[in-house]
Interface confidence: low
């Protein structure tokens, strides 16, 4: 006859490990006892349990409550045992020795591999600002046994670098994602993907990118100067910019205070019916925590009586 076992038994941390040992004998052969021992290289043998055909299972004190026989029905030729709640320290070499009648003793070895699934963590880097060079966006760390794989899933262009630290029974892998920040990255997901044989599916942690920026400011509303004439109602200037964090707007007049009746409403400057008093240089000041921008425009309110000839010239010139 011969012993049937596995070269490697793989189990996830905390699960029960079945250590197989089955004697496939000739007709009439019997198994008297099966001795299980841990036999790590250089450490001698440590008895786990003795499975006796007559007296049942005897477990050594070191494994009390952790070694059991598989549930019935049981084959008398099956010397397999269950090691409950596997921990990392259980990883190693095991040997079963089977005493048979009349064929004698047989032995076989297997390796128990205990997978420690990682618990990944993602740490965002320092605040991202447009104009920085290559900058750490996030780092992702996962520790497990064996070493997990840490990758990134994102549409954002960047570079990755990984490093691994080996511990006695596990390995920690850290991957960093670096990028050159630009405003187009705002709101884009950056996902750390951790793969490991102890996981049923990849673990994913997503970080949403925030890049501070402030666009150049411009003022709209003066596209047609001829509309800025005495008496016109509803005239307004609008300040255009965008930023992250969202910017605030402030209006001033360079050549004096804002005329009475002029309304500031965030990015918009609303005028009452126009008079020549409203002529002047207006400045839109846009700012956020990252930067500030200015844009200035000159408003020239036309008097139709005085400027009729000039207006005709402007029209003909265009």
């Amino acid at each position: 006859g011969e012993l049937e076992t596995s070269d490697v038994v793989t189990v996830v941390l905390g699960q029960d490990a079945k250590l197989p040992c089955f004697y496939r004998g000739d007709s009439g052969e019997q198994v008297g006892q099966v001795a299980w021992a841990r036999v790590d290289a250089g450490e001698g043998a440590q008895e786990l349990a003795l499975l006796h055909s007559k007296y049942g299972l005897h477990v050594s004190p070191a494994y009390e409550g952790r070694v059991e026989q598989p549930p019935p029905p049981r084959n008398p030729l099956d010397g397999s045992v269950l090691l409950r709640n596997a921990v990392q320290a259980d990883e190693g070499e095991y040997e079963c020795r089977v005493s048979t009648f009349p064929a004698g003793s047989f032995q076989a070895r297997l390796r128990l591999r205990v997978l420690v699934p990682p618990l990944p963590s993602l740490n965002p880097g320092p605040a991202l600002e447009e104009g920085q060079g290559l900058t750490l966006a996030a780092s992702c760390t996962a520790e497990g046994s064996p070493a997990p794989s840490v990758t990134w899933d994102t549409e954002v262009k960047g570079t990755t670098s990984s490093r691994s630290f080996k511990h006695s029974r596990s390995a920690a892998v850290t991957s960093e994602f670096h990028l050159v920040p630009s405003r187009s990255m705002n709101g884009q997901p950056l996902t750390c993907v951790v793969s490991h044989p102890g996981l049923l599916q990849d673990q994913r942690i997503t970080h949403i990118l925030h890049v501070s920026f402030l666009a150049e400011a411009s003022v709209r509303g003066l596209e047609d100067q001829n509309l800025w004439h005495i008496g016109r109602e509803g005239a307004m200037l609008k300040c255009l910019s965008e930023g992250q964090p969202p910017p605030s707007y402030n209006w001033t007049r360079l050549d004096g205070p804002l005329p009475s009746g002029v309304r500031v409403d965030g990015d918009t400057l609303g005028f009452p019916p126009l008079t020549t008093e409203h002529s002047g240089i207006y400045v839109c000041h846009v700012s956020n925590e990252f930067s500030s921008r200015d844009s200035q425009v000159t408003v020239d309110v036309l008097d139709p009586q005085e400027d009729s000839g000039k207006q005709v010239d402007l029209v003909s010139a265009s």
């Epitope: 320092p126 605040a127 600002e129 920085q132 060079g133 290559l134 900058t135 750490l136 670098s161 670096h178 925590e289």
Partner: antibody, heavy 117, light 106 residues
Framework: QVQLQESGPGLVKPSETLSLTCTVS????????VHWIRQPPGKGLEWLGV???????DYNPSLKSRVTISVDTSKNQFSLKLSSVTAADTAVYYC???????????WGQGTLVTVSS | DIQMTQSPSSLSASVGDRVTITCRAS??????LAWYQQKPGKAPKLLVY???NLQSGVPSRFSGSGSGTDFTLTISSLQPEDFATYYC????????FGGGTKVEIK
């Protein structure tokens, strides 16, 4: 133009606490950090720590147990305290300003502190 | 901590010379490096930040290059006011400075 000015005693006895103040004028310190950096005579520069306008701090790990930095935002004043000083703490102490990144665009003129009995 | 090694520790040069100072980090600091000029009895003055960006008001004869671990400050044509000590400083984590390079008149 932002200006930083250090002030405090020029002589401190060993085992006592060194206390300096940095006054910032000519600009807002909102969203900026004020750092303390020292330079022993004839030697190089060593970063001690930073405090942000909101009050959060970051210290050099090698000195963390002895350094405390605080802020009085109403006066735009930043304080450095270095406890249990020895002769090795004799240095010119500078305060400096930075944005979110720790490089320093404005510096005070520095103040020499001598530790001696 | 990341160590910054500057070389040479001192050099002698003449007005008009091209001068190069190098700084090496003990691990990658990407582009997170600044260069300062210090004259006796004065505070350091920021010349270059983020490895290659010239600080406002600094003459264009100064330039910075490099990324990762190896960085260079170049003065294309040395002027009399450039004789001073130059320091590199990384800002990737706890800041540390290089030991300095003294530029003296030959």
């Amino acid at each position: 133009q932002v200006q930083l000015q250090e002030s405090g005693p020029g002589l401190v006895k060993p085992s006592e606490t060194l206390s300096l103040t940095c006054t910032v004028s000519g600009g807002s310190i909102t969203n900026y950090g004020v750092h303390w950096i020292r330079q022993p005579p004839g030697k190089g520069l060593e970063w001690l720590g930073v405090i942000w306008s909101g009050g959060s701090t970051d210290y050099n790990p090698s000195l963390k147990s002895r350094v405390t930095i605080s802020v009085d935002t109403s006066k735009n004043q930043f304080s450095l305290k270095l406890s249990s000083v020895t002769a090795a703490d004799t240095a010119v102490y500078y305060c400096a300003r930075s944005g979110k990144w720790y490089y320093f665009d404005y510096w005070g003129q520095g103040t020499l502190v001598t530790v001696s009995s | 901590d990341i160590q910054m090694t500057q070389s040479p520790s001192s050099l002698s040069a003449s007005v008009g010379d091209r001068v190069t100072i190098t700084c090496r980090a003990s691990q990658s600091i990407y582009s997170n490096l600044a260069w300062y000029q210090q004259k006796p009895g004065k505070a350091p003055k920021l010349l270059v930040y983020a490895a290659t960006n010239l600080q406002s008001g600094v003459p264009s004869r100064f330039s910075g290059s490099g990324s990762g671990t190896d960085f260079t400050l170049t003065i294309s044509s040395l002027q009399p006011e450039d004789f001073a000590t130059y320091y590199c400083q990384h800002f990737w984590g706890t800041p540390t400075f290089g030991g300095g390079t003294k530029v003296e008149i030959k």
